[in-house]
């Protein structure tokens, strides 16, 4: 008996050969002995079952002595024995049809958990592997479950069943919720603008939800909301934002928030969470604002930087052109009676630097100049 | 989303053969017949021949028998008819189209130009 | 071979117009009729299948109808997307044959 797998909501084939080359009758029928359909001389004809609006035979093949039976818009219930009847031969053809679905929404938060479920029909014993757009595998039987998914499982997963040496392929599009970056650094100078961008990983046809900057300056012993928004098909509108800063915000995806000024009250790190609609959990970005300032104070020249930064991130003063005077993985670095001459404040990591403040020193008679 | 994507165009001399592939995309392609067609330029469509799901049924317009050859391949998704001694007549675009239950033509290949000249 | 006869073979036409083509079988071909519409440099594009069943994501304002030897494709109100060329498609016997056409233009 030939064994055919079909997959749920789709059409299946099921071929039927007479040995004469010409249109000859035919009946097909399920194991039941109920008559699906058959022909009549030029003209198909339809029986009672249950398949009546779904099966249909191929006509332009009847002449070649192929007579097939086509079923669309497969169910798991379609999986029956099916007989084909011609030239007092019967043909008899197993058809086992599977569907595979994601238990939840195919849209899914990052770090929630993906759930697949194989529907299949009694007395079958498949099994089930499914790669990842990553190219992970997983395997198992009726339900195949990955939890804490990340960015890179978005995709289309494909999915293997296995059934009597036969197999059928499942592809399902899987969309994993989540910026693209967890966190992200600014380093700014004193006084200068601030832009933070916070870029989504996917795209869908209308988003909709609420978010929300909760941010923690280095100075304050507490976090505290800066700006809160609301999106309604990609587009923003601001409902809270605080006095001090006075954040401005994009009208469009993607997120975008201007500091009109980088201060070092401001200096610390902000949460963005955004909440969508019918969606449990959050999507979060982390973002942090580094501020430099380099200034002279009588006979003291200081540079200083506020803000999270990492311990292996060097600090220091240098003459242009020169050496580095002075060098240290501090926060706050300074050179007692510098020379004339223009100074620059360097936040390096690893030798790249990160920022770079300049600051003239005139000689004693004169005021320094900040340029 | 299924799509049938052809082979490119090609230039072939009297008396040679050509072989056009058709390769679906995005979804089951072993559940339907392709049907090939062709048209001359500024003329009617014209059926060539049908090809089974399965690959082991085939049906080719009396015109074009001992002359086509369609065959599928599963594994890569790919039908392919190939036309022998070939004529200035067979001058034409070359479509394939997805064949549903009742030999309509639901989805087509964009087209294969496939040009005879000595 | 079964002939399938279209008239008219070209039609000119205004946007709004109510338009209709029609198809001749040689011979009795029951309901198993398509109507397909081709614009220059493209591929066909099914329309109607049975002689009457709309496919799918097709406009309403196309619809066919018929039986036996006598079908007709009806356009309710012509769009200036409409402008092509129409075929119907006999599929009750092999090889399957198609009408010679007919050339929808702008008046």
């Known amino acids: 008996k030939k064994v055919v797998l079909g997959k749920k909501g789709d059409t299946v084939e099921l071929t039927c050969t007479a040995s004469q080359k010409k249109s000859i009758q035919f009946h097909w029928k399920n194991s039941n002995q109920i008559k699906i359909l058959g022909n009549q001389g030029s003209f198909l004809t339809k029986g009672p079952s249950k398949l009546n609006d779904r099966a249909d035979s191929r006509r332009s093949l009847w002449d070649q002595g192929n007579f097939p039976l086509i079923i669309k818009n497969l169910k798991i219930e379609d999986s029956d024995t099916y007989i084909c009847e011609v030239e007092d031969q019967k043909e008899e053809v197993q058809l086992l049809v599977f569907g595979l679905t994601a238990n939840s929404d195919t849209h899914l938060l990052q770090g929630q958990s993906l759930t697949l479920t194989l529907e299949s029909p009694p007395g079958s014993s498949p099994s089930v592997q499914c790669r990842s757009p990553r190219g992970k595998n997983i395997q198992g039987g009726k339900t195949l479950s990955v939890s804490q998914l990340e960015l890179q499982d978005s995709g289309t997963w494909t999915c293997t069943v296995l059934q009597n040496q036969k197999k059928v392929e499942f592809k399902i599009d899987i969309v994993v919720l989540a910026f693209q970056k967890a966190s992200s650094i600014v380093y700014k100078k004193e006084g200068e603008q601030v832009e933070f961008s916070f870029p989504l990983a996917f795209t869908v046809e209308k988003l909709t939800g609420s978010g929300e900057l909760w941010w923690q300056a280095e100075r304050a012993s507490s976090s505290k909301s800066w700006i809160t928004f609301d999106l309604k098909n990609k587009e923003v509108s601001v409902k809270r934002v605080t006095q001090d800063p006075k954040l401005q915000m994009g009208k469009k995806l993607p997120l975008h928030l201007t500091l009109p000024q980088a201060l070092p009250q401001y200096a610390g790190s902000g949460n963005l969470t955004l909440a969508l609609e019918a969606k449990t959990g959050k999507l979060h970005q982390e973002v942090n604002l580094v501020v430099m300032r380099a200034t002279q104070l009588q006979k003291n020249l200081t540079c200083e930087v506020w803000g999270p930064t990492s311990p292996k991130l060097m600090l220091s003063l240098k003459l242009e052109n020169k050496e580095a005077k002075v060098s240290k993985r501090e926060k706050a670095v300074w050179v007692l009676n510098p020379e004339a001459g223009m100074w620059q404040c360097l936040l390096s990591d690893s030798g790249q630097v990160l920022l770079e403040s300049n600051i003239k020193v005139l000689p004693t008679w004169s005021t320094p100049v900040q340029p | 989303q299924v799509q049938l994507v052809q082979s490119g165009a090609e230039v072939k001399k009297p008396g040679a053969s050509v072989k056009v592939s058709c390769k679906a995309s995005?979804?089951?392609?072993?559940?339907?017949?392709i049907s090939w067609v062709r048209q001359a330029p500024g003329q009617g469509l014209e059926w060539m021949g049908i090809i089974n799901p399965s690959g082991d049924g085939t049906n080719y317009a009396q015109k074009f028998q001992g002359r086509v050859t369609m065959t599928r391949d599963t594994s890569t998704s790919t039908v392919y008819m190939e036309l022998s001694s070939l004529r200035s007549e067979d001058t034409a675009v070359y479509y394939c189209?997805?064949?549903?239950?009742?030999?309509?033509?639901?989805?087509w290949g964009q087209g294969t130009m496939v040009t005879v000249s000595s | 071979d079964i002939q399938m006869t279209q008239s008219p073979s070209s039609l000119s036409a205004s946007v709004g117009d109510r338009v209709t083509i029609t198809c001749q079988a040689s011979q009795d071909i029951g309901n198993y009729l398509n109507w397909y519409q081709q614009k220059p440099g493209k591929a066909p594009k099914l329309l109607i299948y049975?002689?009457?069943s709309l496919q799918s994501g097709v406009p309403s304002r196309f619809s066919g109808s018929g039986s036996g030897t006598d079908f007709t494709l009806t356009i309710s109100s012509l769009q200036p997307e409409d402008f092509a060329t129409y075929y119907c498609q006999q599929t009750y016997n092999t090889p399957l044959t198609f009408g010679g056409g007919t050339k929808l233009e702008i008046k």
């Open positions: 995005g979804g089951t392609f072993s559940s339907y017949a």
């Open positions: 049975a002689a009457s």
């Open positions: 189209a997805r064949d549903i239950s009742n030999d309509a033509f639901d989805i």
